[in-house]
Protein backbone atom coordinates (compact mmCIF):
# COMPACT_ATOMS: atom_id res chain seq x y z
CA UNK A 1 0.00 0.00 0.00
CA UNK A 2 0.80 3.23 -0.66
CA UNK A 3 1.56 6.00 1.81
CA UNK A 4 0.00 9.25 1.46
CA UNK A 5 0.34 12.57 3.64
CA UNK A 6 -1.46 15.83 2.82
CA UNK A 7 -1.03 18.92 4.61
CA UNK A 8 -4.32 20.94 6.09
CA UNK A 9 -4.92 24.58 4.95
CA UNK A 10 -7.38 26.14 7.33
CA UNK A 11 -8.17 30.23 5.94
CA UNK A 12 -10.80 32.82 6.36
CA UNK A 13 -12.92 34.36 2.91
CA UNK A 14 -10.57 36.49 1.11
CA UNK A 15 -7.60 35.00 1.98
CA UNK A 16 -4.96 33.46 -0.51
CA UNK A 17 -3.35 29.70 -0.37
CA UNK A 18 -0.37 30.05 -1.45
CA UNK A 19 1.61 26.71 -1.41
CA UNK A 20 4.30 24.44 -4.03
CA UNK A 21 4.49 21.32 -5.20
CA UNK A 22 8.43 19.93 -5.74
CA UNK A 23 9.20 18.04 -8.98
CA UNK A 24 12.55 16.38 -10.15
CA UNK A 25 14.08 18.80 -11.96
CA UNK A 26 15.75 17.22 -14.85
CA UNK A 27 12.60 14.68 -15.81
CA UNK A 28 9.64 17.21 -15.28
CA UNK A 29 10.72 20.99 -15.76
CA UNK A 30 9.07 21.28 -19.16
CA UNK A 31 6.02 18.83 -18.55
CA UNK A 32 3.25 20.14 -18.10
CA UNK A 33 1.41 20.29 -15.12
CA UNK A 34 -1.90 20.99 -13.39
CA UNK A 35 -4.01 21.49 -10.24
CA UNK A 36 -6.59 19.04 -9.21
CA UNK A 37 -9.31 19.00 -6.86
CA UNK A 38 -10.31 15.65 -5.59
CA UNK A 39 -13.79 15.34 -4.55
CA UNK A 40 -15.17 12.09 -2.64
CA UNK A 41 -16.07 9.26 -4.87
CA UNK A 42 -15.22 11.22 -7.64
CA UNK A 43 -12.35 11.01 -10.18
CA UNK A 44 -9.75 14.60 -9.61
CA UNK A 45 -10.74 17.27 -11.72
CA UNK A 46 -8.37 19.15 -13.23
CA UNK A 47 -8.93 22.97 -12.53
CA UNK A 48 -6.10 24.52 -14.36
CA UNK A 49 -2.69 23.30 -15.59
CA UNK A 50 0.62 25.19 -17.24
CA UNK A 51 0.96 25.85 -20.93
CA UNK A 52 2.64 22.43 -22.69
CA UNK A 53 5.40 22.42 -22.39
CA UNK A 54 5.60 24.61 -19.78
CA UNK A 55 7.27 28.00 -19.46
CA UNK A 56 9.69 28.99 -16.87
CA UNK A 57 7.72 31.17 -14.59
CA UNK A 58 5.57 32.61 -16.86
CA UNK A 59 2.16 32.80 -14.77
CA UNK A 60 -1.13 31.05 -16.02
CA UNK A 61 -4.34 32.31 -14.52
CA UNK A 62 -7.72 30.76 -14.85
CA UNK A 63 -10.11 32.48 -12.83
CA UNK A 64 -8.95 32.94 -9.03
CA UNK A 65 -5.99 30.24 -9.92
CA UNK A 66 -2.58 31.03 -10.92
CA UNK A 67 0.61 28.79 -11.42
CA UNK A 68 3.56 29.71 -12.11
CA UNK A 69 6.12 26.86 -12.80
CA UNK A 70 9.60 27.78 -11.52
CA UNK A 71 12.09 25.38 -13.63
CA UNK A 72 14.92 26.05 -12.06
CA UNK A 73 13.63 25.96 -8.51
CA UNK A 74 11.91 22.59 -9.42
CA UNK A 75 8.94 23.34 -7.89
CA UNK A 76 5.00 24.11 -9.27
CA UNK A 77 3.29 27.67 -7.20
CA UNK A 78 -0.28 27.16 -6.91
CA UNK A 79 -2.02 30.02 -6.00
CA UNK A 80 -5.58 30.32 -5.22
CA UNK A 81 -6.86 33.80 -4.18
CA UNK A 82 -9.68 35.54 -2.83
CA UNK A 83 -11.56 32.19 -1.31
CA UNK A 84 -14.30 30.78 -1.18
CA UNK A 85 -15.97 28.69 1.57
CA UNK A 86 -16.90 26.28 -1.62
CA UNK A 87 -13.33 26.10 -2.37
CA UNK A 88 -12.91 24.15 0.86
CA UNK A 89 -11.70 20.64 -0.47
CA UNK A 90 -8.66 17.97 -1.28
CA UNK A 91 -6.40 19.05 -4.08
CA UNK A 92 -3.44 17.72 -5.53
CA UNK A 93 -0.55 18.40 -8.19
CA UNK A 94 0.18 15.94 -11.42
CA UNK A 95 2.62 15.91 -14.31
CA UNK A 96 0.81 15.14 -17.44
CA UNK A 97 3.55 12.66 -19.25
CA UNK A 98 1.61 11.27 -22.07
CA UNK A 99 0.95 7.97 -23.30
CA UNK A 100 1.87 6.96 -19.35
CA UNK A 101 -0.98 8.66 -16.47
CA UNK A 102 -0.57 11.70 -15.16
CA UNK A 103 2.19 11.69 -11.85
CA UNK A 104 0.63 13.05 -8.61
CA UNK A 105 3.36 14.96 -6.52
CA UNK A 106 3.12 14.91 -2.58
CA UNK A 107 1.75 16.22 -0.37
CA UNK A 108 -2.13 16.68 -1.22
CA UNK A 109 -3.45 19.85 0.25
CA UNK A 110 -6.67 19.81 2.40
CA UNK A 111 -7.98 23.23 2.22
CA UNK A 112 -10.53 24.46 4.65
CA UNK A 113 -12.23 27.99 4.00
CA UNK A 114 -14.13 29.45 6.59
CA UNK A 115 -16.22 32.18 6.65
CA UNK A 116 -15.49 35.11 8.56
CA UNK A 117 -12.98 38.32 7.92
CA UNK A 118 -9.49 37.79 6.74
CA UNK A 119 -8.58 40.35 8.27
CA UNK A 120 -7.53 41.19 12.73
CA UNK A 121 -9.09 38.05 14.31
CA UNK A 122 -11.36 39.34 16.48
CA UNK A 123 -12.66 42.36 14.24
CA UNK A 124 -15.90 43.62 14.56
CA UNK A 125 -18.87 43.49 12.05
CA UNK A 126 -17.59 46.85 10.59
CA UNK A 127 -13.95 45.33 9.57
CA UNK A 128 -13.79 45.12 5.61
CA UNK A 129 -12.45 42.09 4.16
CA UNK A 130 -9.68 41.75 2.51
CA UNK A 131 -10.57 40.75 -0.94
CA UNK A 132 -7.85 41.05 -3.45
CA UNK A 133 -9.26 42.47 -6.78
CA UNK A 134 -7.82 39.52 -9.56
CA UNK A 135 -6.13 41.42 -12.60
CA UNK A 136 -7.54 40.41 -16.08
CA UNK A 137 -6.49 36.51 -17.00
CA UNK A 138 -3.18 36.87 -19.41
CA UNK A 139 -2.74 33.03 -20.38
CA UNK A 140 -5.26 30.32 -19.99
CA UNK A 141 -3.96 26.92 -21.22
CA UNK A 142 -5.81 24.14 -22.60
CA UNK A 143 -5.48 20.89 -20.28
CA UNK A 144 -5.74 17.30 -22.17
CA UNK A 145 -8.54 14.84 -21.51
CA UNK A 146 -6.90 11.98 -19.93
CA UNK A 147 -9.06 8.57 -20.28
CA UNK A 148 -7.47 5.54 -18.59
CA UNK A 149 -8.39 1.45 -18.10
CA UNK A 150 -7.53 2.35 -14.66
CA UNK A 151 -10.17 3.41 -12.03
CA UNK A 152 -10.49 4.71 -8.91
CA UNK A 153 -13.52 3.60 -7.00
CA UNK A 154 -12.88 6.11 -4.27
CA UNK A 155 -11.27 9.43 -3.37
CA UNK A 156 -9.21 9.64 0.02
CA UNK A 157 -12.05 9.57 3.14
CA UNK A 158 -11.85 12.92 4.78
CA UNK A 159 -9.83 12.59 7.75
CA UNK A 160 -10.97 12.89 11.00
CA UNK A 161 -7.99 13.52 12.90
CA UNK A 162 -6.95 16.37 14.52
CA UNK A 163 -4.57 18.21 12.34
CA UNK A 164 -4.86 21.70 12.77
CA UNK A 165 -0.82 22.39 13.46
CA UNK A 166 1.23 23.47 10.57
CA UNK A 167 3.41 20.13 11.30
CA UNK A 168 0.72 17.69 11.25
CA UNK A 169 -0.23 15.69 8.86
CA UNK A 170 -2.69 12.97 7.52
CA UNK A 171 -0.98 9.60 6.62
CA UNK A 172 -3.51 7.83 4.88
CA UNK A 173 -2.69 4.10 5.08
CA UNK A 174 -4.38 1.28 2.68
CA UNK A 175 -5.13 3.24 -0.18
CA UNK A 176 -3.61 1.56 -3.76
CA UNK A 177 -3.11 1.93 -7.31
CA UNK A 178 -3.93 6.01 -6.13
CA UNK A 179 -0.93 7.61 -7.05
CA UNK A 180 -0.92 6.96 -11.10
CA UNK A 181 -4.48 8.79 -11.71
CA UNK A 182 -6.50 9.71 -14.84
CA UNK A 183 -7.74 13.38 -15.06
CA UNK A 184 -11.27 14.24 -15.80
CA UNK A 185 -12.25 17.98 -17.12
CA UNK B 1 11.43 18.46 19.28
CA UNK B 2 13.06 20.45 16.01
CA UNK B 3 16.48 21.72 16.48
CA UNK B 4 18.67 24.01 14.01
CA UNK B 5 22.09 23.88 15.53
CA UNK B 6 24.56 25.96 13.70
CA UNK B 7 28.61 26.07 14.06
CA UNK B 8 30.44 28.41 15.60
CA UNK B 9 31.74 32.04 14.88
CA UNK B 10 34.11 32.45 12.42
CA UNK B 11 36.60 35.00 11.35
CA UNK B 12 37.87 35.75 8.31
CA UNK B 13 40.24 37.52 5.81
CA UNK B 14 38.95 40.09 2.95
CA UNK B 15 38.72 37.19 -0.26
CA UNK B 16 38.68 34.47 1.53
CA UNK B 17 35.76 31.64 2.04
CA UNK B 18 33.69 30.40 4.48
CA UNK B 19 31.43 27.42 5.01
CA UNK B 20 28.83 27.20 7.88
CA UNK B 21 26.79 24.13 8.87
CA UNK B 22 23.35 23.81 10.28
CA UNK B 23 22.63 20.44 12.03
CA UNK B 24 18.73 19.66 11.60
CA UNK B 25 17.08 17.00 13.73
CA UNK B 26 13.68 16.16 15.48
CA UNK B 27 12.26 15.75 12.10
CA UNK B 28 12.95 14.49 8.76
CA UNK B 29 15.69 16.60 7.28
CA UNK B 30 14.50 15.77 3.54
CA UNK B 31 10.93 17.16 3.67
CA UNK B 32 11.37 20.79 4.57
CA UNK B 33 13.26 23.39 2.58
CA UNK B 34 16.44 25.06 4.70
CA UNK B 35 16.95 28.69 4.15
CA UNK B 36 19.95 31.13 4.81
CA UNK B 37 19.29 34.44 6.33
CA UNK B 38 21.72 37.29 7.23
CA UNK B 39 21.72 40.31 9.56
CA UNK B 40 25.05 42.26 9.01
CA UNK B 41 25.21 45.34 12.13
CA UNK B 42 22.72 47.78 11.85
CA UNK B 43 21.14 46.21 9.15
CA UNK B 44 17.94 43.95 8.75
CA UNK B 45 17.34 40.71 7.67
CA UNK B 46 18.21 39.73 4.22
CA UNK B 47 17.10 36.08 2.57
CA UNK B 48 20.25 35.11 0.90
CA UNK B 49 18.68 31.57 -0.40
CA UNK B 50 16.69 28.26 -0.23
CA UNK B 51 18.07 24.99 -0.33
CA UNK B 52 15.74 21.46 -1.12
CA UNK B 53 17.72 19.23 0.82
CA UNK B 54 15.31 16.29 -1.21
CA UNK B 55 16.93 17.54 -4.58
CA UNK B 56 19.78 19.17 -3.31
CA UNK B 57 18.66 22.06 -5.61
CA UNK B 58 19.13 25.90 -4.53
CA UNK B 59 17.54 29.18 -4.97
CA UNK B 60 19.50 31.99 -4.80
CA UNK B 61 18.89 35.78 -4.40
CA UNK B 62 19.76 38.02 -7.10
CA UNK B 63 22.66 39.51 -5.14
CA UNK B 64 24.30 36.55 -3.93
CA UNK B 65 24.33 34.57 -7.27
CA UNK B 66 27.82 33.34 -8.34
CA UNK B 67 29.32 33.64 -4.28
CA UNK B 68 26.86 31.45 -2.47
CA UNK B 69 27.02 28.22 -2.33
CA UNK B 70 24.11 25.79 -0.52
CA UNK B 71 24.85 22.76 -0.35
CA UNK B 72 23.94 19.42 2.13
CA UNK B 73 24.83 15.80 3.44
CA UNK B 74 21.74 14.00 4.48
CA UNK B 75 23.27 11.10 5.97
CA UNK B 76 24.05 13.82 8.76
CA UNK B 77 21.20 15.41 8.14
CA UNK B 78 23.19 19.06 7.79
CA UNK B 79 23.11 21.65 5.62
CA UNK B 80 25.59 24.26 4.29
CA UNK B 81 26.40 27.54 3.52
CA UNK B 82 29.39 28.25 1.89
CA UNK B 83 30.30 32.42 0.62
CA UNK B 84 33.22 33.07 -0.90
CA UNK B 85 35.12 36.08 -2.24
CA UNK B 86 34.65 37.53 1.48
CA UNK B 87 34.55 41.53 1.55
CA UNK B 88 34.17 43.85 4.92
CA UNK B 89 30.27 44.09 4.00
CA UNK B 90 30.05 39.98 4.82
CA UNK B 91 30.45 40.57 8.41
CA UNK B 92 26.93 39.61 9.55
CA UNK B 93 25.38 36.94 11.55
CA UNK B 94 23.98 34.20 9.31
CA UNK B 95 20.92 31.69 10.55
CA UNK B 96 19.94 28.95 9.25
CA UNK B 97 15.67 28.63 8.86
CA UNK B 98 13.48 25.49 8.35
CA UNK B 99 9.97 26.32 6.58
CA UNK B 100 7.26 25.87 8.42
CA UNK B 101 5.87 23.00 6.55
CA UNK B 102 6.74 20.99 3.49
CA UNK B 103 4.12 22.65 0.55
CA UNK B 104 5.16 26.04 1.61
CA UNK B 105 8.15 28.59 1.14
CA UNK B 106 7.09 30.94 3.61
CA UNK B 107 7.32 31.15 7.08
CA UNK B 108 10.26 30.16 8.95
CA UNK B 109 9.44 28.52 12.36
CA UNK B 110 12.44 27.04 13.31
CA UNK B 111 15.96 29.19 13.24
CA UNK B 112 19.16 28.16 14.73
CA UNK B 113 21.26 30.01 16.93
CA UNK B 114 23.27 31.98 14.84
CA UNK B 115 26.59 32.13 13.39
CA UNK B 116 28.68 35.39 13.66
CA UNK B 117 30.96 35.30 10.28
CA UNK B 118 34.02 38.49 10.93
CA UNK B 119 36.01 39.60 7.80
CA UNK B 120 38.54 41.75 9.05
CA UNK B 121 41.98 42.28 7.85
CA UNK C 1 12.99 42.94 -7.37
CA UNK C 2 10.37 42.51 -5.46
CA UNK C 3 10.14 45.13 -2.33
CA UNK C 4 8.15 45.77 1.04
CA UNK C 5 8.41 48.64 2.52
CA UNK C 6 8.02 49.52 6.28
CA UNK C 7 8.54 52.52 8.55
CA UNK C 8 12.12 52.78 9.96
CA UNK C 9 10.70 53.44 13.46
CA UNK C 10 7.09 53.32 15.71
CA UNK C 11 6.77 54.29 19.26
CA UNK C 12 4.02 53.47 21.71
CA UNK C 13 3.67 53.84 25.20
CA UNK C 14 3.14 50.90 27.95
CA UNK C 15 -0.65 49.25 27.43
CA UNK C 16 -1.21 51.22 23.74
CA UNK C 17 -1.53 49.28 21.01
CA UNK C 18 1.27 49.55 18.28
CA UNK C 19 0.50 49.63 14.36
CA UNK C 20 3.44 48.55 11.97
CA UNK C 21 2.57 48.36 8.71
CA UNK C 22 3.91 46.89 5.37
CA UNK C 23 3.22 47.06 1.83
CA UNK C 24 4.15 45.74 -1.53
CA UNK C 25 2.67 45.35 -5.02
CA UNK C 26 -0.10 42.63 -4.91
CA UNK C 27 0.44 42.26 -1.59
CA UNK C 28 -3.22 41.10 -1.31
CA UNK C 29 -2.46 38.07 -3.43
CA UNK C 30 0.66 36.77 -1.44
CA UNK C 31 0.59 35.37 2.12
CA UNK C 32 2.20 37.66 5.23
CA UNK C 33 4.15 36.89 7.92
CA UNK C 34 5.99 38.41 10.57
CA UNK C 35 9.13 38.30 12.58
CA UNK C 36 10.04 39.48 16.21
CA UNK C 37 13.79 40.22 16.39
CA UNK C 38 15.49 41.27 19.67
CA UNK C 39 19.62 41.79 20.05
CA UNK C 40 21.53 38.78 20.18
CA UNK C 41 18.62 36.74 19.53
CA UNK C 42 17.22 34.64 16.65
CA UNK C 43 14.11 35.94 14.61
CA UNK C 44 11.00 34.57 16.14
CA UNK C 45 7.71 33.56 13.63
CA UNK C 46 4.91 35.86 15.20
CA UNK C 47 2.33 35.96 12.49
CA UNK C 48 2.00 33.73 9.41
CA UNK C 49 -0.83 33.27 7.12
CA UNK C 50 -1.41 37.41 7.68
CA UNK C 51 -3.22 36.54 10.55
CA UNK C 52 -2.22 33.35 12.55
CA UNK C 53 -0.51 33.07 15.98
CA UNK C 54 1.87 30.04 16.27
CA UNK C 55 1.80 28.29 19.38
CA UNK C 56 2.77 30.30 22.77
CA UNK C 57 2.76 34.06 20.55
CA UNK C 58 0.73 35.64 22.88
CA UNK C 59 -2.92 36.89 22.14
CA UNK C 60 -2.05 40.77 22.01
CA UNK C 61 -0.25 40.14 18.32
CA UNK C 62 -2.89 40.05 15.61
CA UNK C 63 -2.46 40.78 12.09
CA UNK C 64 -4.52 41.70 9.58
CA UNK C 65 -4.42 43.24 5.89
CA UNK C 66 -6.25 45.69 3.53
CA UNK C 67 -5.64 45.77 0.23
CA UNK C 68 -1.85 45.30 -0.05
CA UNK C 69 -0.39 47.04 3.37
CA UNK C 70 -0.19 44.31 5.83
CA UNK C 71 -0.55 45.84 9.36
CA UNK C 72 0.87 44.08 12.89
CA UNK C 73 -0.86 44.85 15.81
CA UNK C 74 0.31 44.62 19.22
CA UNK C 75 -2.84 46.05 21.79
CA UNK C 76 -1.65 46.29 25.06
CA UNK C 77 1.93 46.61 24.41
CA UNK C 78 4.33 45.54 26.85
CA UNK C 79 8.00 46.75 27.64
CA UNK C 80 9.16 43.08 26.55
CA UNK C 81 7.70 43.64 23.30
CA UNK C 82 10.22 46.48 21.96
CA UNK C 83 12.30 44.92 19.23
CA UNK C 84 12.67 45.30 15.58
CA UNK C 85 9.78 43.94 13.63
CA UNK C 86 9.88 42.18 10.17
CA UNK C 87 7.29 41.50 7.21
CA UNK C 88 7.79 38.96 4.62
CA UNK C 89 6.73 37.19 1.82
CA UNK C 90 7.34 35.25 -1.22
CA UNK C 91 7.77 36.80 -4.38
CA UNK C 92 9.57 34.44 -6.89
CA UNK C 93 12.09 34.02 -3.55
CA UNK C 94 11.70 35.79 -0.19
CA UNK C 95 11.69 39.13 0.28
CA UNK C 96 11.88 40.32 3.98
CA UNK C 97 10.48 44.47 4.61
CA UNK C 98 13.27 46.98 5.87
CA UNK C 99 12.45 46.19 9.54
CA UNK C 100 10.40 48.41 12.15
CA UNK C 101 12.15 49.25 15.29
CA UNK C 102 9.35 49.27 18.06
CA UNK C 103 10.73 51.16 20.90
CA UNK C 104 7.86 51.04 24.44
CA UNK C 105 8.32 54.61 25.61
Known amino acids: ATKLTEEKYELKEGQTLDVKCDYTLEKFASSQKAWQIIRDGEMPKTLACTERPSKNSHPVQVGRIILEDYHDHGLLRVRMVNLQVEDSGLYQCVIYQPPKEPHMLFDRIRLVVTKGFSGTPGSNENSTQNVYKIPPTTTKALCPLYTSPRTVTQAPPKSTADVSTPDSEINLTNVTDIIRVPVFN | QVQLVQSGAEVKKPGASVKVSCKASGYTFNGYYIHWVRQAPGQGLEWMGW????????NYAQKFQGWVTMTRDTSISTAYMELSRLTSDDTAVYYCARDQRKTTVTPFEYWGQGTLVTVSS | SYELTQPPSVSVSPGQTASITCSGDKLGERNVCWYQLKPGQSPILVIY???KRPSGIPERFSGSKSGNTAILTISGTQAMDEADYYC????????FGGGTKLTVL
Open chain 3, 88 to 95: QAWDRNVV
Open chain 3, 49 to 51: QDN
Open chain 2, 51 to 58: LNPNSGGA
